[in-house]
């Protein structure tokens, strides 16, 4: 039985050219996280964090994606095309997979502020 829950930064906005942290947090389960996948709205993989092998950032995103903090991901040099859904998939033993969704809106406005529903302690 899957008892865990995924909390995410929810709907966030950030300024074009700026950076943003995508963060998911798995709680309420004894399960062991063996891998976390980060995907973009078109289901292309941005990065994988493997428990044994560490981080792998996919070539297309190498210049603009930084691993962390934690199991999260930092997107840099944001463009308008970065607007859309992002998904974190936690592979856990023995529960299975947990999936979280974040919606990022990249704003032209210089007054755009990065907002998050919660902050990971």
């Amino acid at each position: 039985m899957m008892t865990g829950t995924i909390e995410t930064t929810g709907n966030i906005s950030a300024k074009k050219g700026g950076s943003v942290i995508l963060q998911c947090h798995l709680s309420s389960t004894m399960a062991q996280v063996t891998q976390v996948n980060w995907e973009q709205h078109d289901h292309s993989l941005l990065a994988i964090r493997n428990a044994e092998l560490g981080w792998h950032i996919y070539p297309a995103f190498k210049d603009r994606v930084a691993p962390g903090p934690g199991l999260g991901l930092t997107l840099q040099s944001l463009t308008m095309n970065d607007t859309g859904e992002y998904f974190c998939t936690y592979h856990t033993y023995p529960d299975g997979t947990y999936r979280g969704r974040i919606f990022l809106e990249v704003l032209e406005s210089s007054v755009a502020e990065h907002s998050a529903r919660f902050q990971i302690p």
Partner: antibody, heavy 122, light 107 residues
């Protein structure tokens, strides 16, 4: 070489306790969950539960609660199974086994210890 | 809990025979199933994971198939060392139960 090496066979009297050790080598110990499996003489494999090697949190299958304790010493890459108040029906081979595979669809017990025979007899 | 039922429990065959062992799950487990081989007095050895993926170093005469609730392990041509016991196991959440085993014996 990735391997799990268990402690040797043990003969115990009813009511006593036993501790089985499982030393891992050749991989990052905390990256893979560790399981314990029992096989009574002439019987099949029985999953006893597992321990999260990141947090040390154990999970026990029904029937293996109370007298059974899973623990870790990550400084020496070793998992332990302790059984207290031993009964004749605890006589079995006990295996530790690593959960290999990193994605949910590829999990399996890919590396096993050689097994430890625990005999409980007066 | 998900229960696994293996059939047959005993299987008599000859060297060179093609044999199939079936594992049925009490509910859908997608492809989260593994097969193990166990020699007497030894630890089990992983043969197949994810229902059909051959573990590294395992001879190609072993193959797995199936998804959902019905899975099979096939040995295309039995060798003398294959006359041992085989177990299936699901890894579709807690608890990760094993089947009761199938002993392959020489006819």
């Amino acid at each position: 070489e990735v391997q799990l090496v268990q402690s040797g066979s043990d003969l115990k009297k009813p009511g006593a306790s036993v501790r089985v050790s499982c030393k891992a080598s050749g991989y990052t110990f905390t990256s893979y969950p560790m399981n314990w499996v029992r096989q009574a003489p002439g019987h099949g494999l029985e999953w006893m539960g597992w321990i999260n090697t990141n947090t040390g949190n154990p999970t026990y299958v029904q029937g293996f609660t109370g007298r059974f304790v899973f623990s870790l010493d990550t400084s020496v890459n070793t998992a332990y199974l302790q059984i207290s108040s031993l009964k004749a029906e605890d006589t079995a081979v006990y295996f530790c086994a690593r959960t290999g595979g990193h994605t949910y669809d590829s999990y399996a017990f890919d590396v096993w210890g050689q097994g430890t025979m625990v005999t409980v007899s007066s | 809990d998900i229960q696994l039922t293996q059939s047959p429990t005993f299987l008599s065959a000859s060297v060179g025979d093609r044999v199939t062992i079936t594992c049925r799950a009490s509910q859908v487990i997608s492809s989260s199933l593994a097969w193990y081989q166990q020699n007497p007095g030894k630890a089990p050895k992983l043969l197949i994971y994810a229902a059909s993926t051959l573990q590294s170093g395992v001879p190609s005469r072993f193959s797995g198939s199936g998804s959902g609730t019905e899975f099979t392990l096939t040995i295309s041509s039995l060798q003398p060392e294959d006359f041992v016991t085989y177990y299936c196991q699901h890894l579709h959440g807690y608890p990760c139960n094993f089947g009761q085993g199938t002993k392959v014996e020489i006819k």
